[in-house]
């Protein structure tokens, strides 16, 4: 054991406390004594640094008096009681509380001992993400909104994506005296490969245990891109009946679909389905350029496709034929 | 009521020791330290040293250490302080008192060394 | 040792006045201060602790306030009954100092 005196009285607490607007707060602070060192303590007292007086004094005989009654209470102190927990509880936090405090205890042979805390007061954002709904338009634009609102101190956001994108980020004052709002814009030019597609807005800040994300589903309005599918170069007489597509990717999805072909309306042997093109059997040889043409909300598009049936060897069965 | 109830005057010659007595009243003796402070015309009140009756820890000023000798009787709830080697500088008030722990002061003891 | 330096020395006042003394410490005591009253004949008597709090009993007419190493105590409306030597004294660290006193006369 450690001979009298040769130990010192010590003061913890921790460097640094959070505390939510709004929210109370607990500032810890105890007085540490070794084994076999005496100490006797008088009073507890809590300053604020850059403020004259004291905010809150626990006094062995006189008890507590506080700056601000409804605001402060010292969470373990008694009369009558061994002082050596000097934890004060703060009610109400403010924007204004932040800052640095002395937890100071008044003791005997050792004279005074003290600790500062710094007061972190933080305000937890709300994070919501959206689409900007776009058009095609050659340029950059905003294609999503991330928002982190009422953070105190600001959040942090960033983007995640493997479409690239540059981020546009703002903050303004947030609806409570302290907090700020943070406004990040993905900014890309916009491209029908893009629609569709995800990117994750990324929000941190002190408050979260870990980061938040938000996923935003890319929304680009386009008008049909169009081709035909189903030929492939090699239809013969007598072959089975046959069935071209028209694909057409557009947002909003297209709202109708027109076959025809150079000449104008579809010959006899082609029937149109919607989006697909029935070509019944044929006897002779056939060299005709069908159209597909697209609708949607925002215009229309249309592809061209040259189809061939031609006489093959009786002994091919790929041709087209009637059964 | 808390009272402090100190001894009487005292003259003694110099060289000689004394001893003062405090009585604690109305309050519980050990749960605070009792100081002893002097007042003088000249150097106005001073500091002597201080005694926690429930531990038996003293402190004491440098400026009157081995002057003064402070001791506590829990039983009776008196303090005590022992002054040696008086000299006429030695002559002032005695205060015993819990200083900033309670209003009270005791009425004082006056030493004169003559 | 920590020096209190109380000024002024002498302070001549009338009923109904408002005064204050002031008390400069050598070195940071942070709010532990305590001043007191002695009026001729008697021992001390306590009004203020921690800077700025009064204990009970004590008139709210005297006000401490202070931290650091500056500190005043003021007497709003002084009654004839104020009429005496106020001192401080700081209990921040060992040894413990006061201030050489002033003293509060009637005009």
């Known amino acids: 054991w450690p001979p009298p005196g040769t130990g010192d009285v010590v003061v913890q607490a921790p460097t640094q406390v959070p505390g939510f607007l709004g929210d109370s707060v607990t500032l810890p602070c105890y007085l540490q004594v070794p084994n076999m060192e005496v100490t006797h303590v008088s009073q507890l007292t809590w300053a604020r640094h850059g403020e004259s007086g004291s905010m809150a004094v626990f006094h062995q005989t006189q008890g507590p008096s506080y700056s601000e009654s409804k605001r402060l209470e010292f969470v373990a102190a008694r009369l009558g009681a061994e002082l050596r927990n000097a934890s004060l509880r703060m009610f109400g936090l403010r924007v204004e509380d932040e800052g640095n405090y002395t937890c100071l205890f008044v003791t005997f042979p050792q004279g005074s001992r003290s600790v500062d805390i710094w007061l972190r007061v933080l305000a937890k954002p709300q994070n919501t993400a959206e689409v900007q709904k776009v058009q095609l338009t050659g340029e950059p634009v905003p294609m999503a909104r991330c928002v982190s609102t009422g953070g105190r101190p600001p959040a942090q956001i960033t983007w995640h994506s493997d479409l690239g994108g540059m981020p546009n980020t703002s903050q303004v004052p947030g609806f409570l005296s302290g907090t700020v709002t943070v406004t990040s814009l993905w900014i890309l030019v916009p491209s029908s490969q893009v629609d569709g597609k995800n990117v994750t807005c990324k929000v941190e800040h002190e408050s979260f245990e870990k980061p938040q994300l938000l996923t935003v589903n890319l929304t680009v309005y386009y008008p049909p891109e169009v081709s035909i599918s189903g030929y492939d170069n090699n239809w013969y007489l007598g072959q089975n009946e046959a069935t071209l597509t028209c694909d057409a990717r557009s947002n909003p999805e297209p709202t109708g679909y027109n076959w025809s072909t150079t000449m104008g309306p579809l010959p006899p042997f082609a029937v149109a389905q919607g989006a697909q093109l029935l070509i019944r059997p044929v006897d002779k040889p056939i060299n005709t350029t069908l159209i597909c043409n697209v609708t949607n909300a925002l215009g229309a598009r249309q592809a061209e496709l040259t189809v061939q049936v031609k006489e093959g060897p009786p002994s091919e069965h790929s041709g087209i034929s009637r059964n | 009521e808390v009272q402090l109830q100190q001894s009487g005057a005292e003259l003694v010659r110099p060289g000689a020791s004394v001893k003062l007595s405090c009585k604690a009243l109305?309050?519980?003796?050990?749960?605070?330290?009792m100081h002893w402070v002097r007042q003088t015309p000249v150097h106005g009140l001073e500091w002597i040293g201080a005694i926690h009756p429930g531990s038996g820890v003293t402190a004491y000023n440098q400026k009157f250490k081995g002057k003064a000798t402070l001791t506590a009787d829990k039983s009776s709830s008196t303090a005590y302080m022992e002054l040696s080697i008086l000299t006429s500088e030695d002559s002032a008030v005695y205060y015993c008192?819990?200083?900033?722990?309670?209003?009270?002061w005791g009425q004082g003891t006056t030493l004169t060394v003559s | 040792d920590i020096v209190m330096t109380q000024s002024p020395k002498f302070m001549s006042t009338s009923v109904g006045d408002r005064v204050s003394v002031t008390c400069k410490a050598s070195?940071?005591?942070?709010?532990?201060v305590v001043w007191y009253q002695q009026k001729s004949g008697q021992s001390p008597k306590a009004l203020i602790y921690?800077?700025?709090y009064r204990y009970s009993g004590v008139p709210d007419r005297f006000t401490g306030s202070g931290s650091g190493t500056d500190f005043t105590l003021t007497i709003s409306n002084v009654q004839s009954e104020d009429l005496a030597e106020y001192f401080c004294?700081?209990?921040?660290?060992?040894?413990?100092?006061f201030g050489a006193g002033t003293k509060l006369e009637l005009k």
């Open positions: 109305g309050y519980t003796f050990t749960d605070h330290e």
């Open positions: 008192t819990p200083l900033w722990l309670r209003r009270d």
């Open positions: 070195q940071n005591v942070a709010t532990n």
């Open positions: 004294q700081q209990y921040n660290s060992y040894p413990l100092t």
């Open positions: 921690s800077a700025s």
